[in-house]
Interface confidence: medium
């Protein structure tokens, strides 16, 4: 079910299936900033909270992924959806909750022994005839299974920030994604004028660390819009 993602989890790079399939309407949606209870194509929000829009998985929390929530799939509207539990259908690793990954279209435990004991008792998962690769992922980026057991250090290849050790995030570097340090106070950060614009970056920066936000540097207020420098500053 996963399509080629060119070493990226960017949803916009996914061909039709995400459009055709969409996110699972029954899954809880991002509780930050709000809790949204989807019901097919109709959505009810709690306390007027809005769903958190996204362009790729990294914009969502570690227990979330980015997808279109409507059944039947309008890929143009994407929000953060709750990660999918073990034994649920998936299209890519980021959809599965931490400690699981997407194997043959099903979220399975990273602990292979656990997987064999529970899943294979009830479902036989087989590889596709002509499109599957050795690891059972259809035309997808292959990564060492080790990354699902140990947190990646700086420079390690990753799929999402939860794959990286504490203090690191998963960010694009050329055409792959690696663990990079979360930004500290005073470090230059990237402020995106519109959601998803950083999907075009070849060298993606991490987000600002806890208690910090990416704001225009005070002495740059007078500069032209295009040259404004943003740094991580205390709230």
């Amino acid at each position: 079910t996963l399509n080629s993602v060119l070493n990226s989890n960017a949803i916009k790079n996914l061909p039709p299936p995400l459009g055709g399939a969409a996110g699972h309407p029954g899954s809880a949606v991002s509780a930050a900033p709000g809790i949204l209870y989807p019901g097919g194509n109709k959505y009810q929000t709690i306390d007027n909270y809005q769903p958190y829009p996204c362009a790729e998985d990294e914009e969502c929390g570690t227990d979330e992924y980015c997808a279109s929530p409507t059944r039947g799939g309008d890929a143009g509207v994407q929000i953060c959806l709750a990660c999918r539990k073990r034994r649920k259908r998936c299209m890519r690793h980021a959809m599965c909750c931490p400690g699981n990954y997407c194997k043959n279209g099903i979220c399975v435990s990273s602990d292979q022994n656990h997987f064999r004991g529970e899943i294979e008792e009830t479902i036989t998962e087989s590889f596709g005839n002509d499109h599957s690769t050795l690891d059972g992922y259809s035309r997808r980026t292959t990564l060492s299974s080790k990354m699902y057991h140990t947190k990646g250090q700086e420079g390690s290849v990753c799929l999402r920030s939860s794959d990286c050790a504490s203090g690191l995030c998963c960010a694009r570097h050329f055409w792959s994604k690696i663990c990079k340090p979360v930004l500290k106070e005073g470090q230059v950060c990237t402020k995106h004028r519109r959601k998803g614009s950083h999907g075009l970056e070849i060298f993606q920066r991490c987000y600002c660390g806890e208690g910090l936000s990416c704001r225009i540097q005070k002495d740059h207020h007078q500069a032209s819009n295009s040259s404004r420098l943003h740094t991580c500053q205390r709230h």
Epitope: P16, G20, R89, H131
Partner: antibody, heavy 119, light 107 residues
Framework: QVQLVQSGAEVKKPGASVKVSCKAS????????INWVRQATGQGLEWMGW????????GYAQKFQGRVTMTRNTSISTAFMELSSLRSEDTAVYYC????????????WGQGTTVTVSS | DIQMTQSPSSLSASVGDRVTITCQAS??????LNWYQQKPGKAPRLLIY???NLETGVPSRFSGSGSGTDFTFTISSLQPEDIATFYC?????????FGQGTRLEIK
């Protein structure tokens, strides 16, 4: 319109195999899973497994493990379900049904294919 | 595996009656439940998805409710064309499981 059209009725002998086809039209075949469900006369619905036409990935119910094979030919938008080592209790109507990837609501069904296993 | 238990297995009601069918899951399935209608000799038809959402084109007299392990399917005012067998189906995780069905007939 969106529809799934299945192959015709089959009569098979015990031990033989049967291959049922399910042709999709009216939507992008690779964008939805195909599930197979069977129903013996006067009985309830029994889920056999799913196939993702895009990747060819499949998941089978344990009961059918080793006997069922789900395949597809994307060039003709057709899914296939082959059941081998047939026995009399496999006599049933076999349905293909479309579901989207995560929500397993079967919103489009084939008309059903009757498979009779008799010596 | 998750087992789905429907009750009653059959029921008889009059046109205009309110009809209720229940479905119980052997473990918590959140709202990952669908309801189907199957008329004799026909393929099933999806009526309700995600426990309470009406599928497009399905009359509003059909409704569903519940979450966790207990679910209810209701026909607010039974019509002659509603005579069929109704099935619940869980998709909380694989393998998918259907209830054994509830046969509905007119008195």
């Amino acid at each position: 319109q969106v529809q799934l059209v299945q192959s015709g009725a089959e009569v098979k002998k015990p031990g033989a195999s049967v291959k049922v086809s399910c042709k999709a039209s009216g939507y992008t075949f690779t964008s939805y899973d195909i599930n197979w469900v069977r129903q013996a006369t006067g009985q309830g619905l029994e889920w056999m497994g799913w196939m993702d036409p895009n990747s060819g990935n499949t998941g089978y119910a344990q009961k059918f493990q080793g006997r069922v094979t789900m395949t597809r030919n994307t060039s003709i938008s057709t899914a296939f379900m082959e059941l081998s080592s047939l026995r009399s209790e496999d006599t049933a109507v076999y349905y293909c049904a479309r579901t989207d990837y995560f929500y397993f609501g079967m919103d489009v069904w084939g008309q059903g294919t009757t498979v009779t296993v008799s010596s | 595996d998750i087992q789905m238990t429907q009750s009653p297995s059959s029921l008889s009601a009059s046109v205009g009656d309110r009809v209720t069918i229940t479905c119980q899951a052997s473990q918590d399935i959140s709202k990952d439940l669908n309801w189907y209608q199957q008329k004799p000799g026909k393929a099933p038809r999806l009526l309700i998805y995600d426990a309470s959402n009406l599928e497009t084109g399905v009359p509003s007299r059909f409704s569903g409710s519940g979450s966790g392990t207990d679910f209810t399917f209701t026909i607010s005012s039974l019509q002659p064309e509603d005579i069929a067998t109704f099935y619940c189906q869980q998709y909380d995780h694989l393998p998918i499981a259907f209830g054994q069905g509830t046969r509905l007939e007119i008195k």
